[in-house]
């Protein structure tokens, strides 16, 4: 059956023998309405991407400069399932590059002009292409060719497999560049031994190069690590102080009928019958004719690459920056220690207008990006296409997961003068209802109930985390007869009561009406019997504060909280009322973007934040007439976060556990990506 | 609430040159920022170029060094002057007050501009 054979693109005569040999086995061990393996042979791996692309094959494994070459357009392919090595129980699909450093030296990243370089090999990816990607804008002109670039950056190096004729600065660490381990300097183990025995002050290598040639912690506690923000960390912490994560060795697909479900479903199968010490006449990890064909011989098995993982997030951001400097060879022409402009990342048409506003009031200083959801902004921040947004503390947890940070927080009771360095407490999670109703918090089932959006603090992840310790199961939509959480799957009864219009119901962005904390508060009004927002909602909606058709008229008093303890008390007394204590909104960017947006930031809030009295003709950073578009409407400054600077101190303890233990009913494709 | 008219669209060719009105009636006094957008068919309305109050104004990268925008706060009036157009600049161009328009939808009927040989 066509639709159900997934074509192989093998790229040497030997890789189309094991392709035939893969597809007989397979077709012995399935049944006949299961997937099957055609072979096509094409001359390179560059040729099997465009056959892909074209349609004329559906998958091949490549190495992660394929994998960039195969993201770009025209090609527009992605990775599906990647090769693990290691053991089942702790998969390795990554491997980091890292620049590593005798301890008692005193240089950092910013500072290797000069110093004496050792690399794994010429245009390898831990020795070579990442390092000097990276290092590519600060390398003295003309950057071409790139070799005598480099030799003029380092005092001295060495480069296996370079020309020591032509660049004898590249070899004169290792003389003659030797390009086997006849050099002693030669790979990883060599460029690390190069570093051992002083000859170099700096190793580009894997993560696991000191460790497999260093077996005493004692020994390794004499080496560090260099950060790309200019700190060092030790050894062990390689997964927060990297150069780049490089994906070992992944199957791509099309993007758009990629058939990425059957190709999965293959090689699921194939690793269950022909993996690892699982059959003697064929064996999917090695070969007799060669070595490395279609997969790679010291693979252990596949993983699913989760369906929200692009090639621009299983890449990551540093590795294509890194390949994409020395592809293009292009520089900004700002030093790169001037801040560029900041792309904040607006949710949707209301919040895009308002950024377009803020932009022109900043001359430019701000720039936006948009996207649909907060989830799709912050894979953009990560990717590099924006910068920056505020966001939810469940937020805040899932870009903290994706290795974003915390900023400044929004800080709602601190006045001025003393609100920017002031550290709050945190705002409270409350469940609303109508004082006419008998409602109490343990007879909420078969109600019908009001969220801000799925993932967020007050509207989900504190009320829903207390009711999974009750139910113990995570079928909310259950519990509830009907309600609206934006970002719940569009059939489910949980977006049966949001309002829309048509395409936007139940979307989590200000198209659907009952989005954010006033959407939620506006559920409660006109047709659901609880709403879980912040503890301000309520006064900040009524007594006319609110000109909404909707809410001019209503009365505070007609509304109390639920207690946890059974009891209902005034919206006045939230601070002996409510679910928890939720952490303050926060500013989030990437690591790399983090100084620069606080210091924008700052500059701009001291134009537009509270201090500007008169929001009707001037721009107001933190007013859109209780919509809360791009920051809470009651944010009364940004403030520093001193040493709350990982989404694990900014949230607390409580708070992430309380997330973690919820992460059971994660809905959060991007979440499951980046936990990948 | 604020009612904008924008004028001074039409066809023109490439490297040519248009002068785009808006003018602004209503309750002006909350006018501080104005800006141009343009959407082009099947394409997202994007922001053009914007001024402040005060004369502050910032442009799209795409039509920096061609567009100058400007504004008389006495006739409540805010031009485009747009130089050497392109085919790319083919649009409908409209004009905002941001005063209403990021809470509701208030958008004026829009200029044409079409370049073409």
């Known amino acids: 059956v066509p639709e159900k054979s997934v074509r192989w693109c093998a790229v040497s005569e030997h890789e189309a023998t094991k392709c035939q040999s893969f597809r007989d086995h397979m077709k012995s061990v399935l049944p006949s309405n299961g997937p099957s393996v055609a072979c096509v042979k094409k001359a390179s791996h560059l040729d099997c991407i465009r056959a892909i692309a074209a349609n004329e094959a559906d998958a091949v494994t490549l190495d992660a400069g394929l994998v960039y070459d195969a993201y770009l357009a025209p090609n527009n392919l992605k990775p599906v399932v990647a090769e693990f090595y290691g053991s089942k129980e702790d998969p390795q699909t990554f491997y980091y590059a890292v620049a590593v450093v005798k301890k008692d030296s005193d240089f950092q990243m910013n500072q290797l002009r000069g110093r004496k370089s050792c690399h794994t090999g010429l245009g390898r990816s831990a020795g070579w292409n990442i390092p000097i990607g990276l290092l590519y804008c600060d390398l003295p002109e003309p950057r071409k060719p790139l070799e005598k670039a480099v030799a003029n950056f380092f005092s001295g190096s060495c480069v296996p497999c370079a020309d020591g004729t032509d660049f004898p600065q590249l070899c004169q660490l290792c003389p003659g560049c030797g390009c086997s381990t006849l050099n002693q300097y030669f790979s990883y183990s060599g460029a690390f031994k190069c570093l051992k025995d002083g000859a170099g002050d700096v190793a580009f290598v894997k993560h696991s190069t000191i460790f497999e040639n260093l077996a005493n912690k004692a020994d390794r506690d004499q080496y560090e690590l260099l950060c790309l923000d200019n700190t060092r960390k030790s050894v062990d912490e390689y997964k927060d102080c990297h150069l780049a994560r490089v994906p070992s060795h992944t199957v791509v697909a099309r993007s758009v009928g990629g058939k990425e479900d059957l190709i999965w479903e293959l090689l699921n199968q194939a690793q269950e019958h022909f993996g690892k010490d699982k059959s003697k006449e064929f064996q999917l990890f090695s070969s007799p004719h060669g070595k490395d064909l279609l997969f790679k011989d010291s693979a252990h098995g596949f993983l699913k690459v989760p369906p929200r993982m692009d090639a621009k997030m299983y890449l990551g951001y540093e590795y294509i920056t890194a390949i994409r400097n020395l592809r293009e060879g292009t520089c900004p022409e700002a030093p790169t220690d001037e801040c560029k402009p900041v792309k904040w990342c607006a949710l949707s048409h209301h919040e895009r207008l308002k950024c377009d506003e803020w932009s022109v009031n900043s001359a430019g200083k701000i720039e936006c990006e948009s996207a649909e959801t907060t989830e799709d902004c912050i894979a953009k921040i990560m990717n590099g296409e924006a910068d920056a947004m505020s966001l939810d503390g469940g937020f805040v947890y899932i870009a903290g997961m994706c290795g974003l940070v915390p900023v400044l927080a929004e800080n709602y009771n601190t006045p001025n003068p003393n609100c920017e360095n002031t550290a709050e407490e945190g705002y409270f999670a409350v469940a609303v209802v109508k004082s006419s109703s008998d409602l109490t918090w343990d007879n909420l089932k078969g109600k019908k109930s009001c969220h801000t959006a799925v993932g967020r603090t007050a509207g989900w992840n504190i009320p829903m985390g207390l009711l999974y310790s009750k139910i113990n199961h995570c079928r909310f939509d259950e519990f509830f007869s009907e309600g609206c959480a934006p970002g719940s799957e569009k059939n489910s009864s949980l977006c049966k009561l949001c309002m829309g219009p048509s395409p936007n119901l139940c979307e989590p962005n200000n198209k659907e009406g009952y989005y954010g904390y006033t959407g939620a508060f506006r559920c409660l009004v006109e047709k659901g019997d609880v709403a879980f927002v912040k503890h301000q909602t309520v006064p900040q909606n009524t007594g006319g504060k609110n000109p909404d058709a909707w809410a001019k008229n209503l009365k505070e008093e007609d509304y109390e909280l639920l207690c946890l303890d059974g009891s209902r008390k005034s919206v006045q007394e939230p601070a002996n009322c409510h679910l928890a204590r939720a952490p303050n909104h926060a500013v989030v960017a990437r690591k790399d973007k983090a100084d620069c947006v606080q210091t924008l930031l700052l500059d701009q809030q001291r134009m537009f934040g509270s201090s500007v009295t008169d929001c009707s003709s001037n721009f107001c950073l933190f007013e859109s007439k209780t919509k809360d578009l791009l920051f809470r409407d009651d944010t009364v400054c940004l403030a520093k976060l001193h040493d709350r600077n990982t989404y694990e101190k900014y949230l607390g303890e409580e708070y992430v556990k309380a997330v973690t233990n919820l992460r059971k009913c994660s809905t959060s494709p991007l979440l499951e990506a980046c936990t990948f | 609430q604020v009612q904008l008219v924008e004028s001074g669209g039409g066809l023109v060719q490439p490297g040519g040159s248009l002068r785009l009105s808006c003018a602004a009636s209503?309750?002006?006094?909350?006018?501080?920022?104005m800006a141009w957008y343009r959407q082009a068919p099947g394409k997202q309305r994007e922001l053009v170029a914007g001024?402040?109050?005060?004369?502050?104004?910032t442009y799209a990268g795409s039509v920096k060094g061609r567009f100058t925008i400007s504004r008389d706060n006495a006739k409540n009036t805010v031009y485009l002057q747009m130089n050497s157009l392109k085919p790319e600049d083919t649009a409908v161009y409209y004009c905002?007050?941001?005063?209403?328009?990021?809470?509701?939808?208030?958008w004026g009927q829009g200029t044409q501009v079409t370049v073409s040989s």
């Open positions: 209503g309750s002006i006094f909350s006018i501080n920022t």
């Open positions: 905002t007050d941001y005063s209403s328009s990021y809470y509701q939808d208030y």
């Open positions: 001024i402040t109050r005060s004369g502050t104004t």
